[in-house]
Amino acid sequence: MAVTACQGLGFVVSLIGIAGIIAATCMDQWSTQDLYNNPVTAVFNYQGLWRSCVRESSGFTECRGYFTLLGLPAMLQAVRALMIVGIVLGAIGLLVSIFALKCIRIGSMEDSAKANMTLTSGIMFIVSGLCAIAGVSVFANMLVTNFWMSTANMYTGMGGMVQTVQTRYTFGAALFVGWVAGGLTLIGGVMMCIACRGLAPEETNYKAVSYHASGHSVAYKPGGFKASTGFGSNTKNKKIYDGGARTEDEVQSYPSKHDYV
């Protein structure tokens, strides 16, 4: 029950996170004009990953796309790439996790297969979240650097007679959306990974069927090398995760924890 809850919650949290990452990537307000300690202008500038916008004091907003690819800063391209990778991984993760959900029955899918898929989607969510956080953080770092550079050169001009006020940009709403969304996706991924551990079938090494011969007991252990992969360590209580491949004998008789030779 707790496993199902953890998995379900992980899925929902990741879903919200990925929706947030998509929203942040599409938002225009990655950087907004800094209004603090700045001459008051009748226009408000803000920029996104794909276009820059100017809002007139009348409320009229005009946005222009970045129609060049080669002319854009490498950092902006990197941020775009990170966000897109995050979205793609997140979307695939969501798709995988839907089939991995314990509450959804798909044919005769084994718990071990679901555990596998849960782990896969969890890792995808973690990487997706990290991509988003990295992308947003790179952009934020770029803004901070540019902010202090433009502050140093706030007023430039010929002999101080004619002054050019540089527009300084500060953190936009999209950065906060991106950070939160990335964090949620990351948390969701961790929850999926935790749920995966609980989904793995609780099997011991001793999946044994006893054959009583006269004189002394011989235990035959089916399952190939799995019974002897302890390399001298105490494997008595180790859970063995076999990817769902079982022999005919095993399908017929599931050994419980109490089946000892």
């Epitope: 820059s52 100017v54 004091s57 002054q163």
Partner: antibody, heavy 119, light 113 residues
Framework: QVLLQQPGTELVKPGASVKVSCKAS????????IHWVKQRPGQGLEWIGR????????TYNQNFKGKATLTVDKSSDTAYMQLTSLTSEDSAVYYC????????????WGQGSLVTVSA | DIVMTQSPSSLTVTAGEKVTMSCKSS????????????LTWYQQKPGQPPKLLIY???TRESGVPDRFTGSGSGTDFTLTISTMQAEDLAVYYC?????????FGGGTKLEIK
């Protein structure tokens, strides 16, 4: 055709107050800023401030803070500018104008109200 | 406040000639976000309110004859009347509509010779 109607003249005594009106018609009053501009006889233009009729948000020129107060009456599509503690320096033509939507310029102007401060 | 300086303050012209007047601002009126210059030109005839001619330094208002042309960027702007006509006799004002408070130039008065 957008129309901004203003009273022709206002004669007031020094130290008194005057409230100049600007009635808008033929457009959605709440959608555009109303600006007020002062022009002394034979002189240039001076921006006083602006008000957004939808929420009464206003921006003033610091030189007119305390002198001019901008208000609107949405029910009658009318903007008002109250001038207080009048002196001869306040004798001028006061224009109301409608801010353009696409830019920050003033698209339409009223005919102006001549305020004369005289004892 | 931004200071707008217009020159000349008055200009005596003849009908049919090309007229050029200048406007300088104390700070750049160019907005980096959209690469637009927030400078407006108005025409004011005697006894009338000003009339919008050109906005964004070079965009002609609808209904304004194409003999009126605005140009310039940053701090230096020009209004040109390609062929002066009698009805163009007026005072021409430039206005900063980028920084608050909005400020106007002193005006250029066109007079007939």
């Amino acid at each position: 055709q957008v129309l901004l109607q203003q009273p022709g003249t206002e004669l007031v005594k020094p130290g008194a107050s005057v409230k100049v009106s600007c009635k808008a018609s033929a457009y959605t009053f709440t959608s555009y800023w109303i600006h007020w501009v002062k022009q002394r006889p034979g002189q240039g233009l001076e921006w006083i401030g602006r008000i957004r009729p939808s929420d009464s948000d206003s921006t003033y020129n610091q030189n007119f803070k305390g002198k001019a107060t901008l208000t609107v009456d949405k029910s009658s599509d009318t903007a008002y500018m109250q001038l207080t503690s009048l002196t001869s320096e306040d004798s001028a033509v006061y224009y109301c104008s409608m801010g353009a939507y696409y830019s920050n310029s003033f698209g339409y102007w009223g005919q102006g109200s001549l305020v004369t401060v005289s004892a | 406040d931004i200071v707008m300086t217009q020159s000349p303050s008055s200009l005596t012209v003849t009908a049919g000639e090309k007229v050029t007047m200048s406007c300088k601002s104390s700070q750049s009126l160019l907005n980096g976000g959209n690469q637009k210059n927030y400078l407006t030109w108005y025409q004011q005839k005697p006894g009338q309110p000003p009339k919008l001619l050109i906005y964004w330094a070079s965009t002609r208002e609808s209904g304004v004859p194409d003999r009126f042309t605005g140009s310039g960027s940053g701090t230096d702007f020009t209004l040109t009347i390609s062929t002066m006509q009698a009805e163009d006799l007026a005072v021409y004002y430039c206005q900063n509509d980028y920084f608050f408070p909005y400020t106007f130039g002193g005006g250029t008065k066109l007079e007939i010779k």
